[in-house]
């Protein structure tokens, strides 16, 4: 806490300008009017204040706005944003996407800080849902943003927002998240033709059920192995050798390189060895010829 001292004669700040960098902390406290600072916040960023001086300026704003800063001030915080705590940010009501962008720009190139996470949370909650423009903005600054949300939070993403998602935005998503996103993507892209649809839906296929994979296998999509390896094991297991061959097209020979990784390994164990042999890839581990396969799950369903 800076001690309250009178401003020396002739030092009262008429405006926020570079002369203030020569003020000591106590002089800034005594000579800069908080209301003036609030109206000229856009100038602060252009002035090379020290971290200690910025602390004083923050303190003045905190005194002026104990219930939280207005958006007109927040939008122009610039580097002063880095001085804010999550507790400060929780008091704010940020509704403008421009304000959000301005603050994200300050943190650009860094990991998502607790301050930024709090800011985004406040903004999204204020909007009620993750609309396309917001998602566009957030993934531009933080490609992993989408995958940092819980499945519950993702359920508030409207299908229309899915158009903003790029493949790299889904790189760190786990299967539970893709389970939520896939049906939204399917809905968003439903009016596209076969090949265009596949290009768009490909990144979301880690949440696709068996019947959708079977449907894709009829469309000459030539899925690559990187995508196939991300599919849900339970969705891949029921596929026949012929369906996998159609699904992968020329990439089918890649199964050999991945035969010990899931889901390929588990799928191989479910296939008849003579069916696997038809691929000519040297895949081993299928059900030996002459063995009877009992589908116990089907038996339980019938009983």
């Amino acid at each position: 806490e800076v001690e309250k001292t009178a401003c020396p004669s002739g030092k009262k700040a008429r405006e926020i300008d570079e002369s203030l960098i020569f003020y000591k902390k106590w002089e800034l406290e005594a000579c800069v009017d908080a209301a003036l600072l609030a109206t000229q916040m856009d100038r602060v960023n252009a002035i090379p204040f020290t971290y200690e001086q910025l602390d004083v300026l923050k303190h003045k704003l905190d005194e002026l706005y104990p219930q939280g800063y207005p958006e007109s001030v927040i939008q122009h915080l610039g580097y002063l944003f880095l001085k804010m705590s999550p507790e400060d940010i929780r008091k704010w009501n940020v509704t403008s996407l421009e304000t959000l962008k301005a603050l994200l720009e300050v943190n650009k190139g860094h990991e998502m800080s607790p301050q930024v996470a709090t800011l985004i949370d406040r903004f999204v909650k204020g909007r009620g849902q993750l609309d396309k423009d917001t998602l566009d903005t957030l993934t531009a600054f933080y490609p992993g943003y989408l995958c940092s949300l819980s499945p519950e939070e993702l359920s508030s993403v409207p299908p229309s927002s899915i158009w903003a998602v790029r493949p790299q935005d889904l790189d760190t998503c786990d299967p539970r998240q893709l389970d939520v996103l896939y049906p939204k993507a399917r809905l968003a892209f439903q009016n596209m033709n076969g090949s265009e649809y596949f290009v768009k839906i490909q990144s979301f296929l880690g949440g696709a059920p068996t019947e959708d994979l079977k449907a894709l296998s009829q469309q000459n999509v030539s899925m690559d192995l990187a995508t196939f390896m991300k599919l849900r094991t339970d969705a891949v297991l029921p596929l026949t050798v012929a369906e996998v061959q159609k699904l992968l097209g020329p990439h089918v020979e890649g199964l050999k390189a991945e035969e010990r990784h899931r889901p390929v390994r588990d799928w191989i164990l479910r296939q008849r060895q003579d069916d696997l042999d038809t691929l000519g890839l040297g895949l081993q581990g299928g059900i030996p010829n002459g063995y009877l396969v009992l589908d116990l799950s089907m038996q339980e369903a019938l009983s």
Epitope: P167, Q168, D224, A226, K230, G254, K256, A257, R262, L281
Partner: antibody, heavy 119, light 108 residues
Framework: EVQLVQSGAEVKKPGASVKVSCKAS????????MDWVRQAPGQGLEWMGD????????IYNQKFNGRVTMTEDKSASTVYMELSSLRSEDTAVYYC????????????WGQGTTVTVSS | EIVLTQSPDFQSVTPKEKVTITCSAS???????LSWYQQKPDQSPKLLIY???NLASGVPSRFSGSGSGTDFTLTINSLEAEDAATYYC?????????FGGGTKVEIK
Amino acid sequence: EVQLVQSGAEVKKPGASVKVSCKASGYTFTDYNMDWVRQAPGQGLEWMGDINPSTGGTIYNQKFNGRVTMTEDKSASTVYMELSSLRSEDTAVYYCARRRIGTGYFDVWGQGTTVTVSS
Amino acid sequence: EIVLTQSPDFQSVTPKEKVTITCSASSSVISSYLSWYQQKPDQSPKLLIYRTSNLASGVPSRFSGSGSGTDFTLTINSLEAEDAATYYCHQWSSFPYTFGGGTKVEIK
């Protein structure tokens, strides 16, 4: 430019563990498996195992009998190889090598990390 | 595991000469699953040939590969000084993946 940059040389005592990192850049990290290959002084190449950075799935050469663990950090585009219960025969240069998912050949290699095990 | 035996272990060759390195597998290897690597002293290995005969990107055309079943060959048609290195064959047809013992090529 595609690059695999490995952590620096290590000197360890027998029985200890070593963890080598391999940071990938210049390509889509999750489209390639990362394999680890080692080379003892004056010797040939020996495949240790691989990891799929997308799923975290691993395959290990049984020769390493539970001593090797491979992990990934997708957010940092980095994979790690930890070898435990070190013995003098583990003295080698350890390489990470990129392998496109669905192929079995290594098209880009790290610069290698020398691990010396000595009492 | 499949053992890959390379011969010769060492070869001293004059520039412009043809070099042939063989890689013999203890069990049959599907030809798509065999590759060759070049390693120069104090460097990491470099992919030379994949799928028995396909040249990797940037590899000069004097290198070629052939073979099937248990016998595979790497040929350097007209050796150049920069080709001094150790060459390894590698199979991923059968687990665990294995490399040959290497053939060191020296320039006379």
